[in-house]
């Protein structure tokens, strides 16, 4: 059975969160997708969304968030660049399917951003444009305002992944193996 999981990413200020959400290709390929933050006791807030209909592998940038929807692979890639401490929180991907409620995708991401030096001297890689070569246009797509009341409750943590070293080694609690998350400053 599919389990709702919440994964924890611990990153330093200035680093990049680079995650993916998968969806059923046949059902949702061209549906509009969104990246939301869930704050305790509040409705999920949409931070960025793809165009409607969603375009294949066409990056959409909203501030420091870049969404890329790979229709042909059933994957939504989400990058949050130049992370700030205040970006810490619980995030999720959803698919808009009006008039029905948004469809939540796996996994939820618990992001913890801490202060700390994460770049190389003289590096300008925290600049979104320098790193990603994406035209500085924000999405023309309007993100729907409605959100699902049932996604307000928090999922119980399943495991945690701590990124604490420069070479991006992660230790998972309650898991026998180690995973790595690439961290590019």
């Amino acid at each position: 059975a599919t389990k709702l999981t919440e994964e924890k990413y611990e990153l330093k200020e200035g680093q990049t969160l680079d995650v993916k959400c998968d969806y059923t290709l046949e059902k949702f390929a061209s549906s509009q997708k969104a990246w939301q933050i869930i704050r305790d006791g509040e409705m999920p807030k949409t931070l960025a969304c793809t165009e409607r209909p969603s375009k294949n592998s066409h990056p959409v940038q909203v501030g420091r968030i870049i969404l890329e929807d790979y229709h042909d692979h059933g994957l939504l890639r989400v990058r949050m660049v130049n992370l700030q401490v205040e970006d810490s929180g619980l995030y999720q991907c959803v698919i808009y399917q009006p008039p029905k409620e948004p469809h939540m995708l796996f996994d939820r991401i618990r992001l913890v951003v801490t202060k700390g030096f994460s770049g190389t001297p003289g590096s300008n890689e925290n600049s979104t444009q320098n790193v990603y070569k994406i035209p500085p246009t924000t999405t023309k797509a309007l993100c729907p305002l409605y959100t699902s009341p049932r996604t307000v409750t928090q999922a119980p943590p399943k495991s945690t992944a701590d990124v604490s070293t420069p070479d991006s080694e992660i230790n998972l609690t309650n898991v026998t193996d180690i995973i790595r998350v690439p961290v590019f400053n």
């Epitope: 599919t2 389990k3 999981t5 994964e7 680079d18 995650v19 993916k20 959400c21 998968d22 969806y23 059923t24 290709l25 592998s57 890329e68 790979y70 042909d72 692979h73 059933g74 994957l75 890639r77 990058r79 796996f106 996994d107 991401i109 790193v131 070569k133 992944a161 991006s168 898991v175 026998t176 193996d177 995973i179 790595r180 998350v181 690439p182 590019f184």
Partner: antibody
């Protein structure tokens, strides 16, 4: 022991289908993507696609779309790759490989099966 | 799709030599690049991930460098057991593609 064990060699006729299995052990099967990579004799590596064993969702490269199906049985920790409408050019060794953590944009393959040779011949 | 071009396609070197293999990406892939070793009749084995990080258990004579479009894989002192074909692989976007491979032989 962390490993991926694949099913044995297959000989198929053109137009037939083949289903290759990949049994995972020693790690949490649903936490990591399973990828399929093939290699024709004397040739390079060709990525076919991926599957998230937790959600069951999968994706494949354009070349294989409509011919490849990736499934899994989470209770026995097995991933399957079925390729249909086989032709002689599909003769290759098919590898399953553990990819990144399901939520992360990590596509390095740190654990591989030994490969399954599929021969397509009339 | 991003094309990965490896050079040379084959090379012959002596035990103890320093060996370099390059991989050129057709567009900027930042550090989204991995290196694999494949011995005859065996499955590939991950050596380097994210351009420069050594996989656990891999000997320190193997290293990787580069970012953007140009990458180098180095064996600091070639050993007889390093006879294999080496592949680079990017994951900057989808689809994932591999270089065509570099066959390494001992002189």
């Amino acid at each position: 022991q962390v490993q991926l064990v694949q099913s044995g060699a297959e000989v198929k006729k053109p137009g037939a289908s083949v289903k290759v299995s990949c049994k995972a052990s020693g790690y949490t099967f649903t936490r990591y993507d399973i990828n399929w990579v093939r290699q024709a004799t004397g040739q390079g590596l060709e990525w076919m696609g991926w599957m998230n064993p937790n959600s069951g969702n999968s994706g494949s490269v354009q070349k294989f779309r409509g011919r490849v199906t990736m499934t899994r049985n989470t209770s026995i920790h097995i991933a399957y790759m079925e390729l249909s409408s086989l032709r002689s050019e599909d003769t290759a060794v098919y590898y399953c490989a553990r990819g990144g953590y399901t939520s992360s944009w990590r596509w390095y393959f740190d654990l591989w099966g030994r490969g399954t040779l599929v021969t397509v011949s009339s | 799709d991003i094309q990965m071009t490896q050079s040379p396609s084959s090379l012959s070197a002596s035990v103890g030599d320093r060996v370099n293999i390059t991989c050129q990406a057709s567009q900027d892939i930042r550090k989204h690049l991995n290196w694999y070793q494949q011995k005859p009749g065996k499955a590939p084995n991950l050596l380097i991930y994210d351009a420069a990080n050594l996989e656990t258990g891999v000997p320190s004579r193997f290293s990787g460098s580069g970012s953007g479009t140009a990458f180098t894989f180095t064996i600091s002192s070639l050993q007889p057991e390093d006879i294999a074909t080496y592949y680079c692989q990017h994951y900057a976007n989808l689809p994932i593609t591999f270089g065509q491979g570099t066959r390494l032989e001992i002189k």
